[in-house]
């Protein structure tokens, strides 16, 4: 009887070892796949939601004409904000016209009220010129209203219906922009 019990115990232990090994393998596999899965899932979700809803923008993004906008719910410094947008296949907001500025400020008023939101505008340290992240110059009516006194790098942000400037290392919300998908219908 004792022998039978110890045999069963050994079998159970062996099973447990095999399960632990399988779990370890799975954990390793999961870890190596996690990064790729994250992006595949995001891509699939965007694709599927677009396919099902014929939606030009991903969920939780706002559409205006050819653009989709995402208003962040977290604060970050300017450079991290840019990285966060890039992760989503977008860039920080680049305001091309007064109409676009009006849409953005109107939407922000409805969504969140009067907070600071980083946009893709920064000031060249040497020349003092303002440039969008793609290297283009903003139109004259879309230059930050006040010059920041910071000795550090200076970046642009939207607040209420104004474009302002601040030390890039301060923490703010941010707005990402990508192109809206064209409807195939």
């Amino acid at each position: 009887k004792l022998l039978q019990v110890s045999t069963i115990a050994m079998q159970q232990q062996e099973k447990l070892i095999q399960q632990e090994r399988a779990l370890l393998n799975f954990t390793e596999w999961k870890r190596s796949c996690a990064l790729q899965m994250k992006y595949c899932q995001a891509f699939m979700q965007n694709s599927l939601s677009s396919a099902h809803n014929s939606s030009p923008c991903p969920n939780n993004w706002i559409q205006n004409r050819e653009s989709c906008y995402y208003v962040s719910e977290i604060w970050s410094i300017w450079h991290t904000s840019q990285e966060n947008c890039l992760k989503e296949g977008s860039t920080l907001l680049q305001i091309e016209s007064k109409e676009e500025m009006d849409f953005i400020t109107g939407s922000l008023r409805k969504i969140k009220g009067s907070y600071d939101y980083w946009v893709g505008l920064s000031q060249d340290g040497h020349s003092g010129r303002w440039l969008w992240q793609d290297g283009s110059s903003p139109s004259p009516g879309l230059l930050p209203a006040e010059r920041s006194q910071s000795a550090n790098q200076v970046c642009g942000y939207v607040k209420s219906n104004s474009l302002l400037s601040s030390n890039c290392s301060t923490w703010k919300y941010f707005i990402c922009e990508k192109y809206a998908l064209r409807s195939s219908v």
Epitope: Q36, C40, F43, E83, N84, L86, G89, T91, D134
Partner: nanobody
Framework: QVQLQESGGGLVQPGGSLRLSCAAS????????MGWYRQAPGKQRELVAA???????AYADSVKGRFTISRDNAKNTVYLQMNSLKPEDTAVYYC???????WGQGTQVTVSS
């Protein structure tokens, strides 16, 4: 296994040009964004330029007007054309996807007379 292979680095005089290439294996390439980063000795890795799958572009202030990023989805390759190079551009250049902590072996760019 996804692999990133950077090439095109070298020694160049100030004012010179180089074109870096990054070939990516795997079908992830066309999703979201790809970027060029650089790391100089004793400094943190920094984003130099990035391009999204839609062709939206972002450059670091220090390279605006001098560097141009582009991508060829058919070849799974992203390029960095570097003109008017300066000694402060000396670094190891890596390509990668923003937010995705995976890198190739990098390519050394040295700007010196």
């Amino acid at each position: 296994q996804v692999q990133l292979q950077e090439s095109g680095g070298g020694l160049v005089q100030p004012g010179g040009s180089l074109r870096l290439s990054c070939a990516a294996s795997g079908s992830f390439f066309s999703i979201n964004a790809m970027g060029w980063y650089r790391q100089a000795p004793g400094k943190q890795r920094e984003l130099v330029a990035a391009i999204t799958n839609q062709g939206r572009i972002a450059y670091a202030d220090s390279v605006k007007g001098r560097f141009t990023i582009s991508r060829d989805n058919a070849k799974n390759t992203v390029y960095l054309q570097m003109n008017s190079l300066k000694p402060e551009d000396t670094a190891v250049y890596y390509c990668g996807r923003p937010g995705w902590d995976y890198w190739g072996q990098g390519t050394q760019v040295t700007v010196s007379s």
